[in-house]
Protein backbone atom coordinates (compact mmCIF):
# COMPACT_ATOMS: atom_id res chain seq x y z
CA UNK A 1 0.00 0.00 0.00
CA UNK A 2 1.26 3.48 -0.87
CA UNK A 3 1.19 5.67 2.21
CA UNK A 4 3.37 8.56 1.10
CA UNK A 5 2.32 12.14 0.50
CA UNK A 6 4.03 14.88 -1.46
CA UNK A 7 4.22 18.37 -0.02
CA UNK A 8 5.03 21.12 -2.53
CA UNK A 9 5.56 24.85 -2.58
CA UNK A 10 2.05 25.05 -4.04
CA UNK A 11 0.97 28.08 -6.04
CA UNK A 12 3.84 30.50 -6.34
CA UNK A 13 4.61 33.69 -8.18
CA UNK A 14 7.85 35.34 -9.18
CA UNK A 15 9.04 38.37 -11.05
CA UNK A 16 10.06 38.33 -14.69
CA UNK A 17 13.85 38.12 -14.96
CA UNK A 18 14.13 36.69 -11.48
CA UNK A 19 14.52 33.14 -10.22
CA UNK A 20 12.42 30.70 -8.24
CA UNK A 21 12.99 27.46 -6.35
CA UNK A 22 10.66 24.55 -7.11
CA UNK A 23 10.59 22.22 -4.14
CA UNK A 24 8.75 19.00 -3.29
CA UNK A 25 9.07 16.76 -0.28
CA UNK A 26 7.95 13.15 0.03
CA UNK A 27 6.92 12.05 3.50
CA UNK A 28 5.02 9.31 5.37
CA UNK A 29 6.73 6.47 3.52
CA UNK A 30 9.87 4.42 4.02
CA UNK A 31 10.15 3.82 0.27
CA UNK A 32 13.53 4.48 -1.29
CA UNK A 33 13.61 7.41 -3.72
CA UNK A 34 15.47 6.19 -6.80
CA UNK A 35 14.85 9.18 -9.04
CA UNK A 36 13.04 12.51 -9.19
CA UNK A 37 11.86 13.89 -12.54
CA UNK A 38 10.93 17.55 -12.98
CA UNK A 39 8.57 18.35 -15.84
CA UNK A 40 6.66 21.23 -17.35
CA UNK A 41 3.73 19.81 -19.30
CA UNK A 42 5.39 17.16 -21.52
CA UNK A 43 8.82 18.79 -21.41
CA UNK A 44 11.52 17.39 -19.17
CA UNK A 45 13.38 19.99 -17.14
CA UNK A 46 15.67 17.72 -15.16
CA UNK A 47 16.17 14.35 -13.52
CA UNK A 48 17.95 13.64 -10.28
CA UNK A 49 18.99 9.99 -10.19
CA UNK A 50 20.12 8.58 -6.85
CA UNK A 51 23.06 6.73 -8.45
CA UNK A 52 23.98 8.94 -11.39
CA UNK A 53 23.30 12.49 -10.23
CA UNK A 54 21.63 15.28 -12.17
CA UNK A 55 20.66 15.46 -15.83
CA UNK A 56 19.40 18.85 -16.97
CA UNK A 57 17.49 18.81 -20.26
CA UNK A 58 19.47 20.55 -23.01
CA UNK A 59 16.46 22.82 -23.61
CA UNK A 60 16.83 24.28 -20.11
CA UNK A 61 20.55 23.90 -19.45
CA UNK A 62 21.33 27.60 -19.53
CA UNK A 63 18.69 28.62 -16.98
CA UNK A 64 17.96 25.66 -14.72
CA UNK A 65 20.18 24.80 -11.79
CA UNK A 66 19.97 21.62 -9.72
CA UNK A 67 18.95 21.91 -6.10
CA UNK A 68 18.65 22.77 -3.37
CA UNK A 69 18.36 19.09 -2.48
CA UNK A 70 16.00 17.36 -4.88
CA UNK A 71 14.49 20.71 -5.85
CA UNK A 72 15.14 22.81 -8.91
CA UNK A 73 16.02 26.47 -9.42
CA UNK A 74 14.59 28.26 -12.46
CA UNK A 75 16.47 31.38 -13.49
CA UNK A 76 15.92 34.26 -15.93
CA UNK A 77 12.18 33.79 -15.74
CA UNK A 78 9.90 34.91 -18.57
CA UNK A 79 6.11 35.13 -18.71
CA UNK A 80 6.22 31.99 -20.88
CA UNK A 81 7.38 30.08 -17.79
CA UNK A 82 3.95 30.56 -16.25
CA UNK A 83 2.22 27.21 -15.86
CA UNK A 84 2.19 23.84 -14.11
CA UNK A 85 5.33 22.05 -12.97
CA UNK A 86 5.44 18.48 -11.75
CA UNK A 87 7.84 16.61 -9.50
CA UNK A 88 7.65 12.87 -10.09
CA UNK A 89 9.21 10.75 -7.37
CA UNK A 90 10.16 7.26 -8.51
CA UNK A 91 10.35 5.08 -5.43
CA UNK A 92 10.94 1.46 -4.51
CA UNK A 93 8.83 -0.43 -3.72
CA UNK A 94 5.92 2.03 -3.79
CA UNK A 95 6.03 3.24 -7.40
CA UNK A 96 5.59 6.88 -8.39
CA UNK A 97 4.30 9.89 -6.51
CA UNK A 98 3.51 13.14 -8.30
CA UNK A 99 3.39 16.66 -6.94
CA UNK A 100 2.11 19.77 -8.72
CA UNK A 101 3.29 23.37 -8.49
CA UNK A 102 1.71 26.30 -10.32
CA UNK A 103 4.08 29.14 -11.14
CA UNK A 104 2.92 32.56 -12.26
CA UNK A 105 5.57 34.89 -13.63
CA UNK A 106 4.57 38.50 -13.17
CA UNK A 107 5.66 41.63 -15.00
CA UNK A 108 5.39 43.71 -11.83
CA UNK A 109 7.59 43.59 -8.74
CA UNK A 110 4.70 42.52 -6.53
CA UNK A 111 5.38 38.80 -6.86
CA UNK A 112 4.71 36.88 -3.66
CA UNK A 113 5.05 33.27 -2.67
CA UNK A 114 1.82 31.40 -2.14
CA UNK A 115 1.32 29.48 1.06
CA UNK A 116 3.01 26.11 1.35
CA UNK A 117 0.34 23.46 1.16
CA UNK A 118 -0.11 19.75 0.89
CA UNK A 119 -1.77 18.06 -2.06
CA UNK A 120 -3.17 14.55 -2.27
CA UNK A 121 -0.73 12.27 -4.07
CA UNK A 122 -1.62 10.50 -7.25
CA UNK A 123 0.47 7.68 -8.55
CA UNK A 124 0.97 4.78 -10.86
CA UNK A 125 3.23 1.75 -10.85
CA UNK A 126 5.79 1.05 -13.59
Amino acid sequence: MMTGTIETTGNISAEKGGSIILQCHLSSTTAQVTQVNWEQQDQLLAICNADLGWHISPSFKDRVAPGPGLGLTLQSLTVNDTGEYFCIYHTYPDGTYTGRIFLEVLESSVAEHGARFQIPHHHHHH
Epitope: D42, L52, W54, H55, S57, H90, T96
Partner: antibody, heavy 120, light 106 residues
Framework: EVQLQESGPGLVKPSETLSLTCAVS????????WNWIRQPPGKKLEYIGY???????YYNPSLKSRVTISRDTSKNQFSLKLSSVTAADTAVYYC??????????????WGQGTTVTVSS | DIVMTQSPDSLAVSLGERATINCRAS??????IAWYQQKPGQSPKLLIY??SYRYTGVPRFSGSGSGTDFTLTISSLQAEDVAVYYC?????????FGGGTKVEIK
Protein backbone atom coordinates in the same frame (compact mmCIF):
# COMPACT_ATOMS: atom_id res chain seq x y z
CA GLU B 1 39.08 8.14 -28.83
CA VAL B 2 37.21 5.97 -26.33
CA GLN B 3 37.01 2.26 -27.17
CA LEU B 4 35.09 -0.51 -25.45
CA GLN B 5 35.89 -4.15 -26.08
CA GLU B 6 33.85 -7.08 -24.78
CA SER B 7 35.48 -10.44 -24.16
CA GLY B 8 34.45 -13.80 -22.73
CA PRO B 9 33.51 -17.33 -23.74
CA GLY B 10 31.23 -17.64 -26.75
CA LEU B 11 29.66 -20.85 -25.47
CA VAL B 12 28.19 -21.44 -22.01
CA LYS B 13 26.40 -24.55 -20.75
CA PRO B 14 22.87 -24.34 -19.33
CA SER B 15 22.75 -23.69 -15.54
CA GLU B 16 26.31 -22.31 -15.59
CA THR B 17 27.42 -18.69 -15.12
CA LEU B 18 28.10 -16.40 -18.06
CA SER B 19 31.06 -14.08 -17.44
CA LEU B 20 31.99 -11.17 -19.69
CA THR B 21 34.44 -8.31 -19.39
CA CYS B 22 34.44 -4.90 -21.04
CA ALA B 23 37.85 -3.26 -21.40
CA VAL B 24 37.74 0.53 -21.65
CA SER B 25 40.58 2.39 -23.36
CA UNK B 26 41.13 6.09 -23.94
CA UNK B 27 39.05 7.17 -20.95
CA UNK B 28 39.02 6.70 -17.18
CA UNK B 29 36.14 4.78 -15.66
CA UNK B 30 36.15 7.10 -12.65
CA UNK B 31 33.49 9.22 -14.32
CA UNK B 32 30.34 8.44 -16.34
CA UNK B 33 28.40 5.20 -16.02
CA TRP B 34 28.95 1.84 -17.69
CA ASN B 35 26.21 -0.34 -19.09
CA TRP B 36 25.45 -3.84 -20.30
CA ILE B 37 22.79 -4.42 -22.97
CA ARG B 38 21.95 -7.60 -24.82
CA GLN B 39 20.17 -8.54 -28.03
CA PRO B 40 18.78 -12.07 -28.47
CA PRO B 41 18.70 -13.29 -32.09
CA GLY B 42 15.93 -11.51 -34.00
CA LYS B 43 14.74 -9.65 -30.91
CA LYS B 44 14.91 -6.14 -29.49
CA LEU B 45 17.68 -4.72 -27.34
CA GLU B 46 17.29 -5.47 -23.63
CA TYR B 47 18.85 -3.34 -20.92
CA ILE B 48 20.71 -5.37 -18.30
CA GLY B 49 22.11 -2.75 -15.93
CA TYR B 50 24.91 -0.35 -15.08
CA UNK B 51 27.72 0.42 -12.70
CA UNK B 52 28.22 4.10 -11.91
CA UNK B 53 31.40 6.16 -11.54
CA UNK B 54 31.05 5.66 -7.77
CA UNK B 55 30.56 1.90 -8.05
CA UNK B 56 26.81 1.88 -7.46
CA UNK B 57 24.90 -0.66 -9.52
CA TYR B 58 21.46 -0.95 -11.06
CA TYR B 59 20.03 -4.20 -12.43
CA ASN B 60 16.95 -4.72 -14.58
CA PRO B 61 14.40 -6.32 -12.20
CA SER B 62 13.73 -9.05 -14.78
CA LEU B 63 17.32 -10.26 -14.34
CA LYS B 64 18.18 -8.91 -10.90
CA SER B 65 18.33 -12.24 -9.08
CA ARG B 66 20.94 -13.56 -11.54
CA VAL B 67 23.06 -10.50 -12.43
CA THR B 68 26.19 -8.99 -10.95
CA ILE B 69 28.06 -6.05 -12.49
CA SER B 70 31.42 -5.15 -11.01
CA ARG B 71 34.46 -3.08 -11.98
CA ASP B 72 38.22 -3.02 -11.66
CA THR B 73 39.32 0.59 -11.98
CA SER B 74 42.99 -0.38 -11.85
CA LYS B 75 42.50 -2.31 -15.10
CA ASN B 76 39.89 0.16 -16.41
CA GLN B 77 37.37 -2.60 -17.04
CA PHE B 78 33.98 -3.74 -15.84
CA SER B 79 32.34 -7.14 -15.84
CA LEU B 80 29.03 -8.91 -16.14
CA LYS B 81 28.11 -12.17 -14.47
CA LEU B 82 24.81 -13.88 -15.24
CA SER B 83 24.09 -17.06 -13.32
CA SER B 84 21.88 -20.08 -14.02
CA VAL B 85 21.76 -19.40 -17.75
CA THR B 86 19.28 -20.99 -20.14
CA ALA B 87 18.89 -20.94 -23.92
CA ALA B 88 16.88 -17.71 -23.50
CA ASP B 89 20.14 -15.97 -22.49
CA THR B 90 21.66 -16.62 -25.92
CA ALA B 91 22.34 -13.14 -27.30
CA VAL B 92 24.84 -10.59 -28.49
CA TYR B 93 26.06 -8.78 -25.37
CA TYR B 94 27.14 -5.15 -25.61
CA CYS B 95 28.86 -2.85 -23.16
CA UNK B 96 28.29 0.88 -23.52
CA UNK B 97 29.18 4.17 -21.91
CA UNK B 98 26.79 6.87 -20.73
CA UNK B 99 27.30 10.45 -19.57
CA UNK B 100 24.25 11.11 -17.40
CA UNK B 101 24.86 14.81 -16.90
CA UNK B 102 24.86 15.60 -20.63
CA UNK B 103 22.89 12.79 -22.25
CA UNK B 104 20.75 11.25 -19.53
CA UNK B 105 20.12 7.58 -20.28
CA UNK B 106 21.29 7.79 -23.89
CA UNK B 107 24.40 5.64 -24.43
CA UNK B 108 26.90 6.97 -26.92
CA UNK B 109 29.97 4.72 -26.98
CA TRP B 110 29.34 1.01 -27.58
CA GLY B 111 31.55 -2.05 -27.84
CA GLN B 112 31.30 -4.14 -30.99
CA GLY B 113 29.38 -6.84 -29.10
CA THR B 114 30.17 -10.44 -28.31
CA THR B 115 27.95 -13.40 -29.14
CA VAL B 116 27.16 -15.80 -26.32
CA THR B 117 25.40 -19.07 -27.04
CA VAL B 118 23.91 -21.17 -24.25
CA SER B 119 23.97 -24.80 -25.24
CA SER B 120 25.07 -28.15 -23.87
CA ASP C 1 8.21 -1.36 -17.33
CA ILE C 2 7.50 1.19 -20.03
CA VAL C 3 6.80 -0.50 -23.36
CA MET C 4 8.09 1.16 -26.52
CA THR C 5 6.30 0.31 -29.75
CA GLN C 6 7.78 1.24 -33.12
CA SER C 7 6.06 1.49 -36.48
CA PRO C 8 6.38 0.43 -39.16
CA ASP C 9 8.41 -2.76 -38.70
CA SER C 10 10.11 -2.07 -42.03
CA LEU C 11 10.21 0.76 -44.51
CA ALA C 12 11.40 0.99 -48.13
CA VAL C 13 12.23 4.49 -49.34
CA SER C 14 13.76 5.79 -52.56
CA LEU C 15 17.19 7.42 -52.42
CA GLY C 16 16.89 11.13 -51.67
CA GLU C 17 13.38 10.75 -50.25
CA ARG C 18 12.25 11.33 -46.68
CA ALA C 19 11.90 8.43 -44.25
CA THR C 20 9.77 8.67 -41.11
CA ILE C 21 9.81 6.24 -38.18
CA ASN C 22 7.37 6.38 -35.27
CA CYS C 23 7.75 5.34 -31.66
CA ARG C 24 5.03 5.23 -29.03
CA ALA C 25 5.52 4.86 -25.26
CA SER C 26 3.01 3.00 -23.10
CA UNK C 27 2.96 6.00 -20.75
CA UNK C 28 4.22 9.57 -20.90
CA UNK C 29 8.01 9.80 -20.97
CA UNK C 30 8.32 13.56 -21.41
CA UNK C 31 11.28 14.10 -23.78
CA UNK C 32 13.50 11.31 -22.44
CA ILE C 33 13.92 9.53 -25.77
CA ALA C 34 17.03 8.43 -27.65
CA TRP C 35 17.27 7.04 -31.21
CA TYR C 36 19.94 4.60 -32.40
CA GLN C 37 21.07 3.31 -35.77
CA GLN C 38 22.30 -0.27 -36.07
CA LYS C 39 23.84 -1.33 -39.35
CA PRO C 40 24.16 -5.06 -40.14
CA GLY C 41 26.88 -6.68 -38.03
CA GLN C 42 27.57 -3.48 -36.09
CA SER C 43 26.70 -2.13 -32.66
CA PRO C 44 24.07 0.60 -32.19
CA LYS C 45 25.13 4.22 -32.70
CA LEU C 46 23.47 7.13 -30.95
CA LEU C 47 21.71 9.56 -33.30
CA ILE C 48 19.32 11.60 -31.13
CA TYR C 49 18.95 12.24 -27.41
CA UNK C 50 16.39 14.25 -25.42
CA UNK C 51 13.90 13.52 -28.25
CA SER C 52 15.22 16.18 -30.63
CA TYR C 53 18.93 16.83 -30.04
CA ARG C 54 21.35 15.49 -32.61
CA TYR C 55 24.40 13.72 -31.24
CA THR C 56 27.78 15.06 -32.38
CA GLY C 57 28.46 14.59 -36.09
CA VAL C 58 25.04 13.17 -36.96
CA PRO C 59 23.69 14.55 -40.28
CA ARG C 60 20.27 14.30 -41.98
CA PHE C 61 18.50 12.91 -38.93
CA SER C 62 16.00 14.80 -36.80
CA GLY C 63 13.80 13.80 -33.90
CA SER C 64 10.58 15.25 -32.56
CA GLY C 65 7.81 14.54 -30.09
CA SER C 66 7.06 14.57 -26.38
CA GLY C 67 4.82 12.64 -24.01
CA THR C 68 4.01 9.36 -25.71
CA ASP C 69 4.56 9.92 -29.45
CA PHE C 70 7.92 10.39 -31.12
CA THR C 71 9.28 10.54 -34.64
CA LEU C 72 12.68 10.03 -36.24
CA THR C 73 13.04 11.58 -39.69
CA ILE C 74 15.76 11.01 -42.28
CA SER C 75 15.47 14.09 -44.49
CA SER C 76 17.06 12.62 -47.62
CA LEU C 77 17.78 8.89 -47.56
CA GLN C 78 21.30 7.83 -48.53
CA ALA C 79 22.58 4.31 -49.24
CA GLU C 80 24.54 4.35 -45.96
CA ASP C 81 21.32 4.88 -43.99
CA VAL C 82 20.20 1.28 -44.59
CA ALA C 83 19.95 -0.03 -41.05
CA VAL C 84 17.63 -0.89 -38.18
CA TYR C 85 16.58 2.08 -36.04
CA TYR C 86 15.63 1.80 -32.37
CA CYS C 87 14.02 4.20 -29.94
CA UNK C 88 14.80 4.03 -26.22
CA UNK C 89 13.22 5.67 -23.20
CA UNK C 90 15.16 6.74 -20.13
CA UNK C 91 12.29 8.35 -18.23
CA UNK C 92 12.43 5.56 -15.67
CA UNK C 93 14.36 2.38 -14.99
CA UNK C 94 14.73 -0.05 -16.51
CA UNK C 95 15.55 1.73 -19.74
CA UNK C 96 13.58 0.06 -22.52
CA PHE C 97 13.89 -0.12 -26.31
CA GLY C 98 11.46 -0.32 -29.17
CA GLY C 99 11.38 -3.38 -31.42
CA GLY C 100 13.23 -1.64 -34.24
CA THR C 101 12.36 -0.41 -37.74
CA LYS C 102 14.31 -1.73 -40.71
CA VAL C 103 14.96 0.90 -43.39
CA GLU C 104 15.75 -0.28 -46.91
CA ILE C 105 16.19 1.29 -50.33
CA LYS C 106 13.19 1.10 -52.65
Amino acid sequence: EVQLQESGPGLVKPSETLSLTCAVSGYSMTSDYWNWIRQPPGKKLEYIGYISYSGRTYYNPSLKSRVTISRDTSKNQFSLKLSSVTAADTAVYYCARGDYSNYGGAMYDWGQGTTVTVSS
Amino acid sequence: DIVMTQSPDSLAVSLGERATINCRASQGVSTTIAWYQQKPGQSPKLLIYSASYRYTGVPRFSGSGSGTDFTLTISSLQAEDVAVYYCQQYYSSPFTFGGGTKVEIK
